[in-house]
């Protein structure tokens, strides 16, 4: 008989689960990289672009060595949920201005959503404590101008790119400890 109803199902091979999560993260990272190249090509914008509503980068190198799987997955899921919300906001607020970046933005959103579901599944497979539902986040204010929206797009994609690299590094490091 299988596990009792409602209890998480133990994964036969957590390393394989982690490996498939890493690969999905990397494919999302490649989508992000290619979209960033398109964005820079079509809407050049020099310098660093910041958006206060984006999550701060999760970890430094020193902290990466001390990571535990629950904290990585919890933090990663929270950060990616924020990026998903920002991508959705970007597509709604900037639909006409960024239409040259569709369907790539849509594909990115779909794959981001898929990675979030994979993380949720991984957490349950590894019998990690499930998080309570996220409180509703305050709505994001529409960009003040088209240029403001383009700068926001640069910030969102740049931040996501770096977050995904951090995620891959953290997950690979944890895989070696399993």
């Amino acid at each position: 008989p299988g596990p009792p109803p409602g209890s998480p199902r133990a994964s036969p091979d957590p390393r394989a689960e982690l490996d498939s999560t890493v690969l999905l993260t990397r494919s999302l990272l490649e989508d992000t990289r290619q979209l960033t190249i398109q964005l820079k090509d079509k809407f050049p914008a020099d310098g660093d672009h910041n958006l206060d509503s984006l999550p701060t980068l999760a970890m430094s190198a020193g902290a990466l060595g001390a990571l535990q799987l629950p904290s990585v997955l919890t933090r990663l899921r929270a950060d990616l949920l924020s990026y998903l919300r920002h991508v959705q906001w970007l597509r709604r607020a900037m639909g006409s201005s960024l239409k040259t970046l569709e369907p790539e933005l849509g594909t990115l959103q779909t794959r981001l959503d898929r990675l979030l579901r994979r993380l949720q599944l991984l957490m349950s497979r590894l019998a990690l404590p499930q998080l309570p539902p996220d409180p509703p986040a305050p709505p994001l204010a529409p960009p003040s101008s088209t240029w403001g929206g383009i700068r926001a797009a640069h910030a969102i994609l740049g931040g996501l790119h770096l977050t995904l690299d951090w995620a891959v590094r953290g997950l690979l490091l944890l895989k070696t400890r399993l």
Epitope: T25, R26, S27, E30, R33, L57, M59, A61, L64
Partner: antibody, heavy 119, light 111 residues
């Protein structure tokens, strides 16, 4: 022009350490990882490891863990690789190479640094 | 570690001919919509140069006579019409997981 310029050739005795530098120019240093690759005479190219300049966080090939140390100086757009406890098999050309984040393919390479380990 | 085997080890052709270089992986390197195989060219005394990334994407500045194909475990680099400057050693590399590894190379020589 995007360029990686490495430090000059080194001759070392067995047991010593060597530190090679790689100065990046022509691109935003923190937008890419920096990887290091070994090419020994008659051997396959061998990946040593990489480092993300924004967060530090090196990842090493297990074969080099404990002997290779990768660091960066962001303000100088320079990456370093130190290899300790040198032995004759470490005689090789060492390359730094720019890597796409978390993808480990290398689109710009340094000119290479020859390290000779000999007593 | 994934082992990449390139064939042939060497190949002698004339300028204008078509070159087909093969790379076989010991396990699949394709997943989640991408094939993690890359191709480089190296000339004596020089650093390798990226030609193709993710199996079929032509690197910026690389002539269109170079193309990459394949998925799973079998990959091919094709040079449609050889030029004098194409005679060199070619390496495939995978990045499906860590560590990335390289093939032993195919040396392309002038006939």
């Amino acid at each position: 022009e995007v360029q990686l310029v490495q430090s000059g050739a080194e001759v070392k005795k067995p047991g010593a350490s060597v530190k090679i530098s790689c100065k990046a120019s022509g691109y935003t240093f923190t937008d890419y990882n920096m990887d290091w690759v070994k090419q020994a005479p008659g051997q396959r190219l061998e990946w040593i490891g990489d480092i993300n300049p924004t967060i530090g966080a090196p990842i090493y090939n297990q074969k080099f863990t404990g002997r290779a140390t990768l660091t960066v100086d962001k303000s100088a757009s320079t990456a370093y690789m130190e290899l300790s406890s040198l032995r004759s098999e470490d005689t090789a050309v060492y390359y730094c190479a720019r890597g796409a984040l978390a993808h480990w393919y290398f689109d710009v390479w340094g000119q290479g640094t020859t390290v000779t380990v000999s007593s | 570690d994934i082992v990449l085997t390139q064939s042939p080890a060497s190949l002698a052709l004339s300028p204008g001919e078509r070159a087909t270089l093969s790379c076989r992986a010991s396990k699949s390197v394709s997943t989640e919509g991408y094939s993690y195989i890359h191709w480089y060219q190296q000339k004596p005394g020089q650093a390798p140069r990226l030609l193709i990334y993710l199996a079929s994407n032509l690197e910026s500045g690389v002539p269109a006579r170079f193309s990459g194909s394949g998925s799973g475990t079998d990959f091919t680099l094709t040079i449609s019409s050889l030029e004098e400057e194409d005679f060199a050693t070619y390496y495939c590399q995978h990045s499906r997981d860590l560590p990335p590894t390289f093939g032993q190379g195919t040396k392309l020589e002038i006939k």
